[in-house]
């Protein structure tokens, strides 16, 4: 039975040209996290294997940096980066947990962080 929950940074906004940290945290389970994948819509941005480390997709290596922790840093943001991002936790023995973050990249300087929320 999957008992864990993923807490994410929720709906967030950031300024064009700036950076943003995408963060997820898995709690309420003793399952072993074996790998965390970061995806944007249908594209794989990065893999963080618990033993074998971080691997950034060549398509994103210039604008994506690993961390902090299991999070992901997006740099040099453009309005095209607006959209859904997913953290996918591969765990043993529970299976897969998925968290969702919506990022809006704004032209102006009115970007503010949204509230945290949980996905079971």
């Amino acid at each position: 039975m999957m008992t864990g929950t993923i807490e994410t940074t929720g709906n967030i906004s950031a300024e064009k040209g700036g950076s943003i940290i995408l963060q997820c945290h898995l709690s309420s389970t003793t399952a072993q996290v074996t790998q965390v994948n970061w995806e944007q819509q249908d594209q794989l941005l990065a893999i963080c294997n618990a033993d074998l480390g971080w691997h950034i997709s060549p398509s994103f290596k210039d604008r994506v940096a690993p961390g902090p922790g299991l999070g992901l840093t997006l740099q040099s943001l453009t309005v095209n980066d607006t959209g859904e991002y997913f953290c996918i936790y591969h765990t043993y023995p529970d299976g897969t947990y998925t968290g969702r973050i919506f990022l809006e990249v704004l032209e102006s300087s009115v970007a503010e962080h949204g509230a945290r929320f949980q996905i079971p």
Partner: antibody
Framework: QVQLQESGGGLVQPGGSLRLSCAAS????????MSWVRQNPDKRLELVAT????????YYPDSVKGRFTISRDNAKNTLYLQMNSLRAEDTAMYYC????????????WGQGTLVTVSS | DIVMTQSPKTLSASVGDRVTITCKAS??????VSWYQQKPGQSPKLLIY???TRHTGVPDRFSGSGSGTDYTLTISSLQAEDVALYYC?????????FGGGTKVEIK
Amino acid sequence: QVQLQESGGGLVQPGGSLRLSCAASGFTFSSYGMSWVRQNPDKRLELVATINSNGGSTYYPDSVKGRFTISRDNAKNTLYLQMNSLRAEDTAMYYCARLGTGTLGFAYWGQGTLVTVSS
Amino acid sequence: DIVMTQSPKTLSASVGDRVTITCKASQDVKTAVSWYQQKPGQSPKLLIYWASTRHTGVPDRFSGSGSGTDYTLTISSLQAEDVALYYCQQHYSTPWTFGGGTKVEIK
């Protein structure tokens, strides 16, 4: 250049134990996660164990979980695989492997050590 | 676990031929795929990672492509030294699993 040299293979009876070693050189061993990959007589490849750079995290597939233990001695630049309760289906060539730097794939492999489980 | 199904199991072609090996994943692996070559009596050698990035020193006659569940390794002009077993591997989900292999022979 990166070199990985396995040893410790041999013939063992079902239910027996064996400890494989992999001597690493040519890179900073303590900075890299390491893996054991085996190739059975039908030439199928299977990743059987991984360990992080400091030895604090390990992973095993269900096929070997509870029977195999991966460990490392960073002072000796050596990777180990302790194999207990061996079965006929564990018969394989065992390779020590390392990912390339910034490479999602095993760029470095040893020459392998053969483990035969038979009565 | 994700199952990687390679085809064909054996491929016989002439020197200079264009050769294609396919790998089908049991679920979307989003380009987290690598390809290896194993010559007789040798250890596997990395050819391609992230589905299409050629590893250092790999001849440019080797190329990889694909997305979703379907991936391809192409040898644009088969050479005698390309006789080997070829394997795909997925890194999308643990355990990282390999395909069953394709044996490439010269006609």
